[in-house]
Amino acid sequence: SQVSQNCHNGSYEISVLMMGNSAFAEPLKNLEDAVNEGLEIVRGRLQNAGLNVTVNATFMYSDGLIHNSGDCRSSTCEGLDLLRKISNAQRMGCVLIGPSCTYSTFQMYLDTELSYPMISAGSFGLSCDYKETLTRLMSPARKLMYFLVNFWKTNDLPFKTYSWSTSYVYKNGTETEDCFWYLNALEASVSYFSHELGFKVVLRQDKEFQDILMDHNRKSNVIIMCGGPEFLYKLKGDRAVAEDIVIILVDLFNDQYFEDNVTAPDYMKNVLVLTLSPGNSLLNSSFSRNLSPTKRDFALAYLNGILLFGHMLKIFLENGENITTPKFAHAFRNLTFEGYDGPVTLDDWGDVDSTMVLLYTSVDTKKYKVLLTYDTHVNKTYPVDMSPTFTWKNSKLPNDITGRGPQ
């Protein structure tokens, strides 16, 4: 049915879906606080620009009776139920902020006539790529995949002189929502990562992973996994690891590695950690009592979604353009706006760009050190530490296949 948008005559409303099934188990109160903080800033920015308009948010809660798994498994139906609620109320804002689960976003995008923009904190999966009116404010799987292929191919750095073409991927099904979709993208046989690699096998059992660590007949020295150091320790423990094994630990939304007082445990010496540059938002572990770094990133994406809407609203109002048009709905991409922690860049498809950081453990200091950075916007790697104090022989990353070239 035709739903009227509360989006004109100087009054602009944001519909915020508060879903019980969410990419991260974040109290909805924290998300409300983030949205309200964003609204306060947007109102100030619009006022400073001489635009005397009203901007509000409507929080739409699902009843939570049926869809109460708390994670993303039953989010598809919850998302559609919330859309039905909007339809029944005949009331929609200028923009929809909320669905964070890949399942719900994908289905909602399919099942709605999208003449309005949808902003997501999450929706990490490849199935949410290239959606014309969807903006994603947390790094999607495609960005990770492009980094990995870029890094695998790199062979002209002092610490990486071999191109890699093989990998194991550890994926046991207990991953968080972000990790699930990151690994899913690497596993998919039709993905860019799979296309570019000559050999890739998914390890699904703890024992498979543990056996590979010392298996002389292994087909690759490289293992990709996703999670934090504790997750790795639970799996690997203090087991011996062959000297040319490289574990790539994807832990994007965790800035604990950058804290001054953090020492890398011994089991991390064979590990390269891929995380996001903390930018302006570096927290001391003692700092954020309510929010872990990951959950801050999630709430921050909601806040930045509000600021993004404010940015677009300001541009359209200053140009005297209508907000309830396909042009507005398709405009939330290929731009940079002032986010809460600093500038935020969106690519041509509305996905957030960021600086990824690859860390290693220094054998000298037992600290995490930056090996290289990668700018997702230009798909380019920038070496930082040209003579890293690696655990690997000759302070170089080994070849990905044992016995192929000098080790």
């Epitope: 924290n30 606080d33 983030a34 903080e37 964003g38 800033i41 100030g44 920015r45 302006n280 938002s281 570096l282 927290l283 001391n284 003692s286 700092f287 954020s288 009592r289 309510n290 929010l291 801050r296 709430a299 921050l300 806040l303 809460y340 922690d341």
Partner: nanobody, 115 residues
Framework: EVQLVESGGGLVQPGGSLRLSCAAS????????MTWVRQAPGRGLEWVAK????????YYVDSVKGRFTISRDNAKNSLYLQMNSLRAEDTAVYYC????????WGQGTTVTVSS
């Protein structure tokens, strides 16, 4: 340890001025938005003013616009609130808070506007 310590409150007559300070320690002050929040007797919390990490943006609640000025000195890890033309309705406990998470609060400083 992360700490925020407010000072500068007191008793002032209507029309008078006060300057509140907030000293921050234990975190990288220059990376965070800061907010002054107040709580009047028997009322809920109300944000008063906020300032971006680099001082580049400042916003105020309507009731204090033109009277209050928020500022910061990142070199000194300090936040300030200059309050002019004070009114009885500005009587409250004033807190500084950091980040949108509002995780860290000071103990507050009391401002009483009365003749």
């Amino acid at each position: 340890e992360v700490q925020l310590v407010e000072s500068g409150g007191g008793l002032v007559q209507p029309g008078g001025s006060l300057r509140l300070s907030c000293a921050a320690s234990g975190f990288t002050f220059s990376r965070y938005w800061m907010t002054w929040v107040r709580q009047a007797p028997g009322r809920g919390l109300e944000w008063v003013a906020k300032i971006r990490y680099d001082g580049g943006e400042k916003y105020y609640v309507d009731s204090v616009k033109g009277r209050f000025t928020i500022s910061r000195d990142n070199a000194k890890n300090s936040l300030y609130l200059q309050m002019n033309s004070l009114r009885a309705e500005d009587t409250a406990v004033y807190y500084c808070a950091t980040d949108f998470t509002r995780d860290v609060w000071g103990q507050g400083t009391t401002v009483t506007v009365s003749s």
